[in-house]
């Protein structure tokens, strides 16, 4: 049975298909696979109709293959059983287990640190531009423009807390009203979900792993986008968030309190502060319209400084002009008086790498962006590999059952809500929804957490980050307390509203279905994942922002026809799906349109053509690098530089996506040998597929 029975066998025209959304490879053992699956008409269903890329319903398409690619893989234990080991073997196994655990923690630490550095890199590259987005107050009164500003700024600074703090400062200094700030907060919520989507891209090596990881990451995006689509018009019409938060603030007399404990930062800061430290006030100053801040560097040079309220000496025409007689003297020529001036005296320089480099922010940003992405990718591969070697057999079964099993009937419905609480709690502990969702992404990829379980965890993460913001607001000074608290509460109630919309009733869990659909498309056409990221997080917001600059009439003039077209496509797709008989024959499928308008295949051919040219050039380099890697790792069966093969061969491989077989010698003793004796059999290495397929984009 399909995950959504209401969609099963609902193809309006099963005769018309193009290639399936996924290759036949599945992690389900072969014996469980049916040779072929037929639909009610007896027609073999081995391929799926590809719907137009602009239709949201393309993402809800049922996967008609014999095996459901969303089924969690069985992680077979290839090692010797514990009972069959001698003392030496058992000792070695324990040491290896401990070693793996330490390595896992180490890579996880590096992973989190690289996320922090990635955020700093984004701020160095786009922080000033992001600040300038905020400085155009007239545009921000337009809710749609506010929304996209929130998205763009958060994407550029890779931190919703940074954009939130800018909004708070602007509201506190009356540069922005709470009403205008709400759409920006909604946008910030969307922008923060890009991090785990980037992390998911790192798992593009293996199609099924990527399918799950990308869907797991984008479930967050879809939740945020869908919530905004419903709640932004609702807020614009009723101002319910503004009214509700005002009511909460007036009902409960909030006092200043303690900020949330920075548990994760305490651990990561010592390391990340050695790499880069930023002066985030610069972005804030730009946002507040301080033109002088435009020339300041975001890179923090001085870490220790004392702020002296110094009495500055100024000359006055006579003693009558002195501040007071007690602040009046003469140096023999002029009469002087005292004025209080706050001066910052730098004492000690910061200890990060770039402190003595006089490189521009952009250069440092690009360096850090490259390095952090490489480290992020490397850590991810190693985490996946380590988890793959650890989570086998009994351990895997226990963990998967614990994470993915529901409570017994009649309390099954409570499981999701518990997951929401767990997500919120974990995010509260690590103080970052990006870190939590990004750490969860590889686990979804390797099949430890199902999408259905990842969804409430992600929703919880959204709540967790807002509770952190509420505590941060409570710890803010008196003059900003009310505005920061109201904005934090708006953020909180926005997420609560989103959960109420897209979680309680299983039928409304649209983000899961959309994410799975996107996962299917991205697994087949991996470039589409990059396209999705660029289109939804950069192109669309920038276009809307550009149109907003042109004014309301232009925005409406361009936006309304596009929205109407999307609605038309959506309605038509719905009718094709539910009751095709009421439609004219021509409209029962999309074949009346040119192929490029309803299939990704022509686009894929164009992209393949473009990448092939590039691949040919770097072919030799790729092959040499790959061979060296294989030699170092001791890999006996290594697919090097597939860019050098014939096109036909490449196509064939694309369909099959053969797993890499690596001998025991390939595996590091502390990695996936899983305590087995030297030379025992071959272990299927989960993550080497990621290495073998680095040219997917």
């Amino acid at each position: 049975m399909a995950p959504w029975p209401e969609l099963e066998n609902a193809q309006p025209n099963p005769g018309k298909f193009i290639e399936g959304a996924s290759g036949p490879q599945s992690s389900i053992p072969a014996k469980d696979k049916e040779a072929s699956k037929t639909n009610d008409n007896g027609t073999p269903v081995a391929k799926t109709e590809l719907l137009p890329s602009y239709s949201a319903l393309v993402l809800i398409e049922e996967h008609p293959e014999g095996t459901d690619p969303w089924d969690l893989p069985e992680l077979q234990d290839t090692g010797i059983k514990w009972s069959e080991r001698d003392t030496k073997g058992k000792t070695l196994c324990i040491f290896q287990g401990v070693g793996k655990f330490i390595l896992l923690l180490g890579f996880l630490y590096l992973f989190v640190c690289s996320l922090d550095v990635l955020s700093s890199a984004f701020q160095l590259v786009g922080g000033k531009v992001a600040g300038q987005f905020f400085s155009n107050n007239s545009i921000m009164s337009n809710p749609v423009a506010g929304l996209v500003i929130g998205v763009l700024v958060t994407v550029m600074v890779q931190s919703s807390s940074t954009s939130s703090s800018i909004i708070v400062s602007m509201v506190a200094s009356s540069l922005l009203t709470v009403r205008a700030a709400i759409p920006i907060i909604m946008g910030a919520n969307i922008g923060t979900s890009i991090t785990n989507t980037i992390v998911a891209l790192m798992q593009a090596g293996d199609r099924n792993e990527f399918r799950r990881a990308f869907a797991g990451a984008t479930v967050h995006d879809f939740f945020n986008w869908l919530s905004v689509f419903v709640l932004l018009p609702l807020e614009a019409a009723t101002h319910y968030l503004e009214i509700l938060t005002n009511l909460v603030l007036e009902t409960f007399k909030f006092q200043n309190g303690e900020d949330a404990p920075d548990i994760l930062k305490v651990i990561t800061d010592p390391f990340t502060k050695l790499i880069i430290q930023l002066d985030k006030k610069v972005i804030q100053q730009i946002a507040m319209g301080d033109s002088a801040a435009q020339n300041k560097s975001l890179i923090k040079i001085w870490c220790k400084s004392i702020t002296n309220v110094t009495e500055m000496n100024v000359t006055v025409p006579s003693t009558d002009n002195c501040t007071s007689p007690s602040y009046c003297w003469t140096d023999g020529i002029q009469t002087w008086t005292i004025q209080n001036v706050t001066q910052k005296e730098n004492i000690a320089k910061c200890q990060h790498i770039f402190v003595n480099f006089s490189l521009p922010d952009l250069a440092v940003g690009i360096i850090l962006l490259t390095v952090s992405l490489v480290v992020l990718c490397g850590c991810l591969i190693m985490i996946v590999k380590l988890l793959g070697s650890v989570l086998r057999g009994q351990v895997a079964t226990v963990i998967k059952k614990t994470l993915n099993t529901d409570f017994p009937f009649p309390f099954a419905w409570l499981t999701g809500y518990l997951a929401i609480l767990v997500g919120a709690g974990m995010t509260f502990i690590v103080q970052s929804s990006s870190v939590f969702t990004s750490a969860m992404t590889p686990l979804i990829g390797i099949g430890v957490i199902s999408i259905e379980r990842a969804y409430p965890l992600t929703l919880g993460s959204n709540i967790g980050t807002t509770t952190t913001a509420i505590l941060a607001a409570l710890a803010s000074p008196g003059n900003t307390l009310r505005s920061s608290l109201q904005i934090a509460l708006c953020h909180f109630f926005f997420n609560i509203s989103g959960i109420l919309l897209w979680y309680p009733i299983p039928f409304t869990r649209l983000p899961i279905r959309l994410a799975k659909g996107l996962g299917n498309i991205s697994a087949k056409y991996r470039w589409f994942a990059v396209f999705y990221l660029i289109f939804f997080f950069f192109v669309t917001p920038l276009t809307v922002f550009g149109l907003s600059l042109a004014g309301w009439p232009v925005l409406v003039g361009v936006g309304v026809p596009i929205i109407l077209l999307l609605l038309l496509v959506l309605c038509l797709r719905m009718l094709q799906f539910r009751c095709p008989r009421i439609l004219p024959l021509k409209l029962r499928d999309w074949n009346f349109l040119p192929l490029w308008m309803h299939s990704l295949k022509p686009w894929d051919n164009v992209i393949s053509l473009a990448t092939t040219c590039f691949q040919r050039r770097c072919c030799c380099c790729c092959r040499v690098c790959c061979r060296v890697c294989c030699m170092v790792c001791g890999c006996k069966c290594c697919r090097c530089s597939k860019c050098c093969r014939d096109q036909g061969e490449e196509e064939e491989e694309k369909e099959q996506d053969i797993p890499v077989k690596a001998s025991g010698a390939f595996d590091n003793a502390a990695m996936s040998k899983e305590c087995q004796d030297e030379g025992k059999g071959q272990v299927e290495v989960l993550s080497m597929k990621a290495l073998s397929n680095t040219t997917v984009f």
């Epitope: 000359t315 007690s326 602040y327 003297w329 003469t330 140096d331 023999g332 020529i333 002029q334 009469t335």
Partner: antibody, heavy 119, light 107 residues
Framework: QVQLVQSGAEVKKPGASVKVSCKAS????????VHWVRQAPGQGLEWMGA????????SYAQKFQGRVTMTRDTSTSTVYMELSSLRSEDTAVYYC????????????WGQGTLVTVSS | DVQMTQSPSSLSASVGDRVTITCRAS??????LNWYQQKPGKAVKLLIY???RLQSGVPSRFSGSGSGTDYTLTISSLQPEDFATYYC?????????FGQGTKLEIK
Amino acid sequence: QVQLVQSGAEVKKPGASVKVSCKASGFTFTSYNVHWVRQAPGQGLEWMGAISPGNGDLSYAQKFQGRVTMTRDTSTSTVYMELSSLRSEDTAVYYCARGRTGMGAVDYWGQGTLVTVSS
Amino acid sequence: DVQMTQSPSSLSASVGDRVTITCRASQDVYSYLNWYQQKPGKAVKLLIYYTSRLQSGVPSRFSGSGSGTDYTLTISSLQPEDFATYYCQQYNIFPWTFGQGTKLEIK
């Protein structure tokens, strides 16, 4: 080191004028004010006025207004004090002293120039 | 002009003694007061500025205090090189005015 070297002793007749020089070294001449203070035999110190070598600003004590003229030569880092219409009570040791702009104290003093007014 | 009166005019003390010299202004000078030391044949030296701030290079046995119109210079333990004439000077109101001086002699 900071030095203020004054010209030698002078003997003048009543009604005459005297011009005492003060050559500065060891510091940025234009960043400080140069003050003139005199001390009559067996008496206390008496402030006469000051000049700012940087911009040429001047200030004289009311008592000496019209009789005293202070000038500066930035090329030689020298300040001059000319006192006209000398009287016997003008017999004193004349000191030049350095005072930082904005400060009401003089931290370095010259060795003094004795001006004797007698007929 | 503000009149500055020092007392005593002269003072005899022994090495190791604690000595206090007083300076009274004819009006409130709001702590804008300095102390100088003058030795025969030597340049005048600034000891304390703004009532109580010790000029660099001046021994810590010298200290100043006071407010309003009354100010004091204290030498906690008299040393042989401290025998000299001491002057107070106000700079609150133009022109600068000095006290008549206090001569400190060896007993």
